[in-house]
Interface confidence: low
């Protein structure tokens, strides 16, 4: 018969014949022959392959280096890589999460729009009129100015984006 020019799914063409690919979690040791099947071996303890493959070496699991602020979020298996994330208060510098940086704080005059996660940094927003933030924080939102009226007080000093209003007693002489 004519040697094949293409193979079925989960097969590969070598020496004019179709050999089975190794399943995820295993690596290729030797190609099949006319008389023998493809020979595969399981990946080692700290290694993985996540696809049907003909790789002769498994991939090393990612190392979540604590020196870079990383910790294991999900332990790798023979078929999956380790997933790293950052320690509390830190976030990944990239999608691959190769290192971590401290969460950004929002300066006075800015509040937290979105609190940081293990993979995204703090998102800050300027405090709009009627709101303020007088601290540098990775958690605090902009606070509304105090409503002097609800306390039967009057505004003695106007608020800014960094300071609250100052309330004082009403002038009793006023009609």
């Amino acid at each position: 018969p004519e040697p094949p020019t293409a193979c079925r799914e989960k097969q590969y063409l070598i020496n004019s014949q179709c050999c089975s690919l190794c399943q995820p979690g295993q690596k290729l040791v030797s190609d099949c022959t006319e008389f023998t099947e493809t020979e595969c071996l399981p990946c080692g303890e700290s290694e993985f392959l996540d696809t049907w493959n003909r790789e002769t070496h498994c991939h090393q699991h990612k190392y979540c280096d604590p020196n870079l602020g990383l910790r294991v979020q999900q332990k790798g298996t023979s078929e999956t890589d380790t997933i790293c994330t950052c320690e509390e208060g830190w976030h990944c510098t990239s999608e691959a999460c190769e290192s971590c940086v401290l969460h950004r704080s929002c300066s006075p005059g800015f509040g937290v729009k979105q609190i940081a996660t293990g993979v995204s940094d703090t998102i800050c927003e300027p405090c709009p009129v009627g709101f303020f933030s007088n601290v540098s924080s990775a958690f605090e939102k902009c606070h509304p100015w105090t409503s002097c009226e609800t306390k039967d007080l009057v505004v003695q000093q106007a608020g800014t984006n960094k300071t609250d209003v100052v309330c004082g007693p009403q002038d009793r002489l006023r009609a």
């Epitope: 399981p42 080692g44 700290s46 090393q60 699991h61 691959a96 190769e98």
Partner: antibody, heavy 119, light 107 residues
């Protein structure tokens, strides 16, 4: 032709620091795992550290963990080993070695650079 | 850590001899075993990887076998340039460990 050329070795006092470099040529540096392996005078081989190709993950021998840092600059085709808090037992020839992708055997080696830690 | 133990530590042989060096792992390492040759003052050279795969450019008189915990490096007919120290190394898991070496000397 694959070539690995180490530099940066020398005499350093205990507690001191040294940075080794390994200039690579003749292959696509970024596609390969790179490692440091050392050999104390008259002794056998000891794996020190590896840095993998994908996300640049790293591994260290317990004897150097927290003191040594492996890194790579793919734009310069260069591997580094930053060695801090050096001890007398770190005295050795340090070899830079290449391994395929994420693999953990060493198919090409540099000629080595001698690090001597002594007062 | 996985301990690698080679035997013998040293060996005297003559040109043309068949020589066998063994390497034992302290736990099963499947076929993740590699062999290196090192000559005095030189860097090691990879001979065999994955227990039995011959590295490109290495003479066919070198062969490797074994799986699990017991492995063998065989030189079918010793040549003058084969007198050197041989190391096994496991690549099953970190820390990657080497055997203590086998020094092959001329008888």
């Amino acid at each position: 032709e694959v070539q690995l050329l180490e530099s940066g070795g020398g005499l350093v006092q205990p507690g001191g620091s040294l940075r080794l470099s390994c200039a690579a040529s003749g292959f696509t540096f970024s596609s390969y795992a790179m490692s440091w392996v050392r050999q104390a005078p008259g002794k056998g081989l000891e794996w020190v550290s590896s840095i993998y190709s994908g996300g640049g993950g790293t591994s260290y021998a317990d004897s150097v963990k927290g003191r040594f840092t492996i890194s790579r600059d793919n734009s310069k085709n260069t591997l580094y080993l930053q060695m801090n808090s050096l001890r007398a037992e770190d005295t050795a020839v340090y070899y830079c070695a290449r391994g395929p992708a994420y693999s953990s055997f060493f198919d090409y080696w540099g000629q080595g650079t001698l690090v001597t830690v002594s007062s | 850590d996985i301990q690698m133990t080679q035997s013998p530590s040293s060996l005297s042989a003559s040109v043309g001899d068949r020589v066998t060096i063994t390497c034992r792992a302290s736990q099963s390492i499947s076929s993740y075993l590699n062999w290196y040759q090192q000559k005095p003052g030189k860097a090691p050279k990879l001979l065999i990887y994955a227990a039995s795969s011959l590295q490109s450019g290495v003479p066919s008189r070198f062969s490797g076998s074994g799986s699990g915990t017991d492995f063998t490096l065989t030189i079918s007919s010793l040549q003058p340039e084969d007198f050197a120290t041989y190391y096994c190394q496991q690549s099953y898991s970190t820390p990657y460990t080497f055997g203590q070496g086998t020094k092959l000397e001329i008888k």
